[in-house]
Each structure stands twice: as C-alpha cells, then as structure tokens.
C-alpha cells in the first residue's frame, strides 16, 4: 500500500481541518487507513481520524480541533494497520480555507434596489470574523452570457444592486464566497445559490 499524493490539509480556523490525499490504488479508506494527529503542546494526546473515500483512490479526513491559534502545529501520521505510510506536520494558521457564508437572501421589495444579505460564518470571538471580505456571483439561467462577480471589500455582509442594471422579466441566481485577507487564505466554497425573479420595470417617463 502506497501514498500517491501526500495529504494536504486546510483549516476552517474554527473547529475542523480537512486533509485529502490519494492512494496508489483503489482503497477502502475507512477500513484500511487511520490518520493520527497530535497538537505539539504540553501533555497533548494523540487523536484518531477515520478517513472517508473521495473517489476511487482518494481519501478525506475531517480532523476535529479546538479553537485555532497561530502557534498551533500538529504532527500527522497516516497508518495502514501497523504500517506507517506517511509522516508530516500541519500548521492550521498557514493553511486556512474559510467556512462558506450562509443564509443568502435576496430582498426585492426595496424600491429600485436588489438587496442581497448573507451571514458571516464565524462567531464574533473568532479572529476571522472581522477579516472576511466576499465575492458575490450573480448569473442568469435565461441569459447564459450574463455572469458578474461583485467584490464586497467592506465588512458588512450585504450587497445592493440597482434593479435597473438587471434585465426585467427574467430569473437570476446569486451565490457568495469569502476569504480573509490578513490570514492569506484561499477562497471558501460557494454558498448555496438563491434564485429570484427580476420584475422591476423602469418608470414610463424613463423608457
């Protein structure tokens, strides 16, 4: 049994780190493998993660963690029974992938504005809470040529779009993702998309 692609891990900087790797051949990850991890810290114990399959040769493990701080460093050992397949380390603060924003809602009853709101995925006491900026993707299923990214570089999880900039009488979809500038993170996954119908019509005298 051989590791083809070494484990690569990312942290949500809250409670979970996700490690993915590829094996040399088809593997029943949960039956054959264990990923052991231990915080390098006084009197810390070794903890075990049972991986799941992620495609034929891929495995994924979700490591439960306490709060993350910048000093944290974990040792990782991938075992197949009594055989040590791989040994490495992981510093969560240097490999952060934020959680996806949630509760994306579209408000179309605000005069001539489409208002999008969503929730910050972190509690206020988390370091990432005040560091997230967002990208909102808006596209139309009726108009495949229309797709826009709106960068939200302020802290408030809202975006206002003049309804007049969207075509009337067609449906739109929106989704949002996040990243944290000062932690040099990757982008989060996209939130689930939400759909709305743009019924806005310009006043008669402006047509």
């Amino acid at each position: 049994m051989k590791v083809l692609q070494e484990p690569a891990c990312v942290s949500d900087y809250m409670s979970i780190s996700t490690c993915e790797w590829k094996m040399g051949g088809p593997t029943n990850c949960s039956a054959e493998l264990r990923l052991l991890y231990q915080l390098v810290f006084q009197s810390s114990e070794t903890h075990t993660c049972v991986p799941e399959n992620n495609g034929g040769v891929g495995c994924v493990c979700h490591l439960l963690m306490d709060d993350v701080v910048s000093m944290d460093n974990y040792t990782l050992d991938l075992w197949a029974g009594q055989q040590l397949l791989w040994k490495g380390s992981f510093k969560p603060s240097e490999h952060v992938k934020p959680r996806a924003p949630g509760n994306l809602t579209v408000h179309t009853n605000v005069s001539d504005t489409v208002l999008l709101t969503w929730s910050n995925p972190y509690p206020p006491d988390n370091y990432l809470y005040n560091d997230l900026t967002y990208a909102v993707n808006i596209w139309s299923e009726n108009d495949p040529a229309y797709s826009r990214i709106h960068n939200v570089t302020y802290l408030k999880p809202t975006l206002r779009i003049p309804a007049s900039t969207l075509k009337s009488g067609i449906s739109y979809r929106a989704r949002v993702r996040a990243w944290a500038q000062h932690y040099n993170t990757t982008w989060s996954e996209w939130s689930p998309s939400t759909k709305w119908y743009n019924s806005y019509r310009e006043p008669f005298e402006q047509r």
Epitope: L39, F41, Q42, S43, S44, E45, T46, H47, L64, M65, D66, D67, V69, S70, M71, D72
Partner: antibody, heavy 125, light 112 residues
Framework: EVQLVESGGGLEQPGGSLRLSCAGS????????MTWVRQAPGKGLEWVSS????????YYADSVKGRFTISRDNSKNTLYLQMNSLRAEDTAVYYC??????????????????WGQGTTVTVSS | DIVMTQSPLSLPVTPGEPASISCRSS???????????VDWYLQKSGQSPQLLIY???KRASGVPDRFSGSGSGTDFTLKISRVEAEDVGFYYC?????????FGQGTKLEIK
C-alpha cells in the same frame, strides 16, 4: 471533594529504590495529566516529572532522567513514581499535583490546582 | 530550558499595605492572546503549595480577590492589594508552557 494522597516515602540508602504512590479521588482521574514536584529541605520547589492522562506522554527533569519512572493506573486512580539509584540529593518532600485536562485536542490548563500532602523521602547511609 | 527569575526574595510588609512580586522568564510564555502560561503559588509554613493564579491573570477557585496577576510575554507581577497576616509564606511563580516546568526561587513574604 477533590483529593490527592501520597504514600511510599521513607528512609533509603544511596543506590536504593522507593516507589511513591498518589491516590486521586473526587475527579475523573484519567482525564487529567498528573505531575510530581519535590522540595529539598530548606529549598524551593522543583518539578520532577509529568504524565498525560492516557499515560502515553511522559516528561522528566534532567536530574532524574534514567533513574525515575512515572506511571499511572487509571483503573485504580493512582499515580506512581518509581525511584531507582537514589542519591542523597533526592532527599525531599515529594508532592503529586493535578495538572491539565489532557483528553481535549488542546489540553485545558487550570494550574496545578490540587496538591497532595506530600511524602518525605530521605536518602542517607 | 526556560529560566524564571523572581524578585524580591524577601518582602517585609505592614498589614493592610499592598505588596508586589515580580517574575521574569527567559522566553515568552504567551501562547495565544490572553494566555500566558505562568502560575503563582503560595506555600505556607508546613503546608503543601496552593494555587493562587494560573494563565497569568486567572484567579484560582477560592482565592481572595485581593490577589491579582498581571503581565504578558516575559514580565509578570503578583499583587496583593491589602496584605493580611494569613498571607505570610513563600510565593513562587512557575512557567507551565512546556516541560521542564520551572519555578522561581521563591519570595518570602513576612509581616513587619
């Protein structure tokens, strides 16, 4: 009531052996790391050894490494310190203390918040 | 190993007056925001040590509020706002960030 009670101290000749015990009660013993601290007559406190809740992680002061062995029996809620090749400078009162919660991913620390009454070890010919 | 240096080594105090003990570590004991791994212990004559302060500034259960801990990184202070006769004994700081745990030399607090 959370309590630690040491026993096993006594008078021993240089080169001899003693085994100290520390019985814990009133808390979930296996969840906590445990520590031994000693105090030579008229001197300050000196850390001796620590052990994690599972017993998998063990730490020693350089002054006792290779001579002392810390262990625990979680089924008996008891901590041990096996002392071999005793020297005159090991003469001290030995205390056991309740250390951090070690079962969490990051051990939770609340200080060495419970201490035993101490047991006296005298090494002399 | 981390070295813990305490001062003063002797502290005569008048009852009702404040007292302050300093402890300096040879390397930072700050692990994360607000968590400095330094403790303060009091050992009264003929007794086992007792925990006063942990993680730099957190008062242990049952410890009177006249005791307080402060400082960060390498410099720490134990303050007693109004010394009482029962506070006499030896005070020790200890670094608990990593083994070997190291105690300061101890400060003998006595009543004038």
């Amino acid at each position: 009531e959370v309590q630690l009670v040491e026993s096993g101290g006594g008078l021993e000749q240089p080169g001899g052996s003693l085994r100290l015990s520390c019985a814990g009660s009133g808390f979930t013993f296996r969840d906590f790391a445990m520590t031994w601290v000693r105090q030579a007559p008229g001197k300050g406190l000196e850390w001796v050894s620590s052990i994690s809740g599972s017993g998998d992680n063990i730490y020693y002061a350089d002054s006792v490494k290779g001579r002392f062995t810390i262990s625990r029996d979680n089924s008996k809620n008891t901590l041990y310190l096996q002392m071999n090749s005793l020297r005159a400078e090991d003469t001290a009162v030995y205390y056991c203390a309740k250390d951090r919660v070690s079962i969490t991913i990051r051990p939770r620390y609340y200080g060495l918040d419970v201490w035993g009454q101490g047991t006296t070890v005298t090494v002399s010919s | 190993d981390i070295v813990m240096t305490q001062s003063p080594l002797s502290l005569p105090v008048t009852p009702g007056e404040p007292a302050s003990i300093s402890c300096r570590s040879s390397q930072s004991l700050l692990y994360s925001i607000g968590k400095n791994y330094v403790d303060w212990y009091l050992q009264k004559s003929g007794q086992s040590p007792q925990l006063l302060i942990y993680l730099g500034n957190k008062r242990a259960s049952g410890v009177p509020d006249r005791f307080s801990g402060s400082g960060s990184g390498t410099d720490f202070t134990l303050k007693i706002s109004r010394v009482e006769a029962e506070d006499v004994g030896f005070y020790y700081c200890m670094q608990s960030l990593q083994t070997p745990y190291v105690f300061g030399q101890g400060t003998k607090l006595e009543i004038k």
